[in-house]
Interface confidence: low
């Protein structure tokens, strides 16, 4: 039978040292339905948009694979220059193409990003800034 699209975030948690790059993995199991992927930190109405495949400027974020390829199903991202302020749970969310607006279709289970300070002084300094 045709499988309904699933959004797989294989890593429940990721630990990254401050100043390094975090890789957040996300894979869709199907090309259907067509529509963009967005990444958010947190859930609910107050969630923070981290990356939008369709539009926007996200200078710290790069994609692991070429999302412009129409048969791409890998939506993993890298976030550079991680600080303690980046800690949180990140969700990979598939949208279904719609008019006038795309509609949220399915979310991954989330990946918790933890940030390890290079040293305690550095950690406190970054938290205060």
């Amino acid at each position: 039978l045709e499988e309904e699209l699933q959004v797989i975030q294989p890593d429940k948690s990721v630990l990254v040292a401050a100043g390094e790059t975090a890789t957040l993995r996300c894979t869709a199991t199907s090309l259907i339905p067509v529509g963009p992927i967005q990444w958010f930190r947190g859930a609910g109405p107050g969630r923070e948009l981290i990356y939008n495949q369709k539009e926007g400027h996200f200078p710290r974020v790069t994609t692991v694979s070429d999302l412009t390829k129409r048969n791409n199903m890998d939506f993993s991202i890298r976030i550079g220059n991680i600080t303690p302020a980046d800690a949180g749970t990140y969700y990979c969310v598939k949208f279904r193409k719609g008019s006038p607006d795309d509609v949220e279709f399915k979310s991954g289970a989330g990946t918790e990003l933890s940030v390890r300070a290079k040293d305690l002084c550095n950690f406190n300094e970054q938290l205060e800034n």
Epitope: E2, S30, L31, I32, V34, N71
Partner: nanobody, 118 residues
Framework: HVQLVESGGGLVQPGGSLRLSCAAR????????MSWARQAPGKGLEWVGA???????VYEKSVKGRFTISRDNAKNTMYLQMHSLKPEDSARYYC????????????SGQGTLVTVSS
């Protein structure tokens, strides 16, 4: 081996209608999502829309409200009903199982040519 045969294309005036058919063989049609795509001369492949195994549909914004995708599982056939055709709809239309594909080489069908002109 997956076989897809598209038919129903032709020359139509702006504002006219056409119905395209896609006859499928070699896979479980009734259990598969199916899509339509099109390619205008000298341009890349553009996804048009898709129909799921349960009959629900999704469309490219530019054709929504004008095009309707349907399927007849007993005949292993998918249809694309096109109304209010515009010159920019002129293209070779292809069908494919599942989702969007990279290029027309991923289709086993030859496509069917639609020309919208007065």
């Amino acid at each position: 081996h997956v076989q897809l045969v598209e038919s129903g294309g032709g020359l139509v005036q702006p504002g006219g209608s056409l119905r395209l058919s896609c006859a499928a063989r070699g896979f479980s049609f009734r259990d598969s999502a199916m899509s339509w795509a099109r390619q205008a001369p000298g341009k890349g492949l553009e996804w048009v829309g898709a129909i799921y195994s349960d009959g629900s549909t999704v469309y490219e914004k530019s054709v929504k409200g004008r095009f309707t995708i349907s399927r007849d599982n007993a005949k292993n056939t998918m249809y694309l009903q096109m109304h209010s055709l515009k010159p920019e709809d002129s293209a070779r239309y292809y069908c494919a199982p599942k989702g969007v594909v990279a290029d027309e080489g991923d289709y086993s069908g030859q496509g069917t040519l639609v020309t919208v002109s007065s």
